[in-house]
Amino acid sequence: PGPPPGPPRVSPDPRAELDSTVLLTRSLLADTRQLAAQLRDKFPADGDHNLDSLPTLAMSAGALGALQLPGVLTRLRADLLSYLRHVQWLRRAGGSSLKTLEPELGTLQARLDRLLRRLQLLMSRLALPQPPPDPPAPPLAPPSSAWGGIRAAHAILGGLHLTLDWAVRGLLLLKTRL
């Protein structure tokens, strides 16, 4: 065995990485909030909108105390992956009315992808279990009408907002345990 190829540079400590993941999640939460408000201004929501294919909210704020690091990161990754696929679907099949949300929707998609990469890197650095995401659900059918696309957008952005809000709280709590 030979010598290592020069002194390695120190990559971010996983605790510092958790900090930057929290910042990225907060920034994504602000983007989502802003985009949801933009959508409400253009197409006011008539009540709550649901989409059966979206993940159920991971955890109530009250249950956060019992969380374990692997469980949070695994669940968060799976849920965000689902939202990423829904945002991609929305951009592809949402119809002309939703084109008014570009380029913000594209930026949201890119940041969501970046957050997913960051979470996976954190799990790798900590050597936590990385179960595969749930098998992809059948492809989402295009909305039946322009209003169907708008209702789906309300549901996706609303659900993503709640998930990211939960994620920030969960990650901050986990930081104290690392």
Partner: antibody, heavy 114, light 111 residues
Framework: EVQLLESGGGLVQPGGSLRLSCAAS????????MHWVRQAPGKGLEWVAV????????YYADSVKGRFTISRDNSKNTLYLQMNSLRAEDTAVYYC???????WGQGTLVTVSS | QSVLTQPPSASGTPGQRVTISCSGS?????????VHWYQQLPGTAPKLLIY???ERPSGVPDRFSGSKSGTSASLAISGLRSEDEADYYC???????????FGGGTKLTVL
């Protein structure tokens, strides 16, 4: 400067045992998952085992399951690999690696031969 | 037999661009797990070259870049130099093995 220093390699007979150690410095050892990766002479890299940052999760390659045990002592910044029932095909340079792995030691040679 | 498949060898002349492929399956690269690339210079320990598909650790020149699509990934080296002559390995987490897997390695020769 990050340093991972393996020790404990050497010549051992088939069926014998060895314990490898890896002393870490220059980074927060207790915040990183740690791996053992080996490389047989003239061959590619083969992952052997991994242990989570706090020691609560351990995974092994099928080829070593039931024979090798990975462990760590965060108070001593040290990683271990206990190797039992050694076979000729376990002959390799054993690297200790941290994180993704981001950092690698220089390796220690284990030779299993009669 | 490695879980990730790489060509055993690749070559190029100085200044050229070379690409090394890494093919996986639905239990590793295709399962949304990130790909990492390592460079092993002769007689030395491996060194992390690319992580999370396309990120470079500090100190790695921007001549090195990575990409991923579906169940495969690739490493591109532009402006090839003689010091790039080394073995290159891809790696990714594999859910069926509950651990990382490596490609068989590609020996890059600079002609």
């Amino acid at each position: 400067e990050v340093q991972l220093l393996e020790s404990g390699g050497g010549l051992v007979q088939p069926g014998g045992s060895l314990r490898l150690s890896c002393a870490a410095s220059g980074f927060t050892f207790s915040s990183y998952g740690m791996h053992w990766v080996r490389q047989a002479p003239g061959k590619g890299l083969e992952w052997v085992a991994v242990i989570s940052y706090d020691g609560s999760y351990k995974y092994y390659a099928d080829s070593v399951k039931g024979r090798f045990t990975i462990s760590r002592d965060n108070s001593k910044n040290t990683l271990y690999l206990q190797m039992n029932s050694l076979r000729a095909e376990d002959t390799a340079v054993y690297y200790c690696a941290a994180g993704v792995p981001d950092y690698w030691g220089q390796g220690t040679l284990v030779t299993v031969s009669s | 037999q490695s879980v990730l498949t790489q060509p055993p060898s690749a070559s190029g002349t100085p200044g050229q661009r070379v690409t090394i492929s890494c093919s996986g399956s639905s239990s590793n690269i295709g399962s949304d797990y990130d790909v990492h690339w390592y460079q092993q210079l002769p007689g030395t320990a491996p060194k992390l070259l690319i992580y999370s598909n396309n990120e470079r650790p500090s100190g790695v020149p921007d001549r090195f870049s990575g990409s991923k699509s579906g169940t495969s990934a690739s490493l591109a080296i532009s402006g090839l130099r003689s010091e790039d002559e080394a073995d290159y390995y891809c790696a990714a987490w594999d859910s069926s093995l509950s651990g990382p897997v490596f490609g068989g390695g590609t020996k890059l020769t600079v002609l």
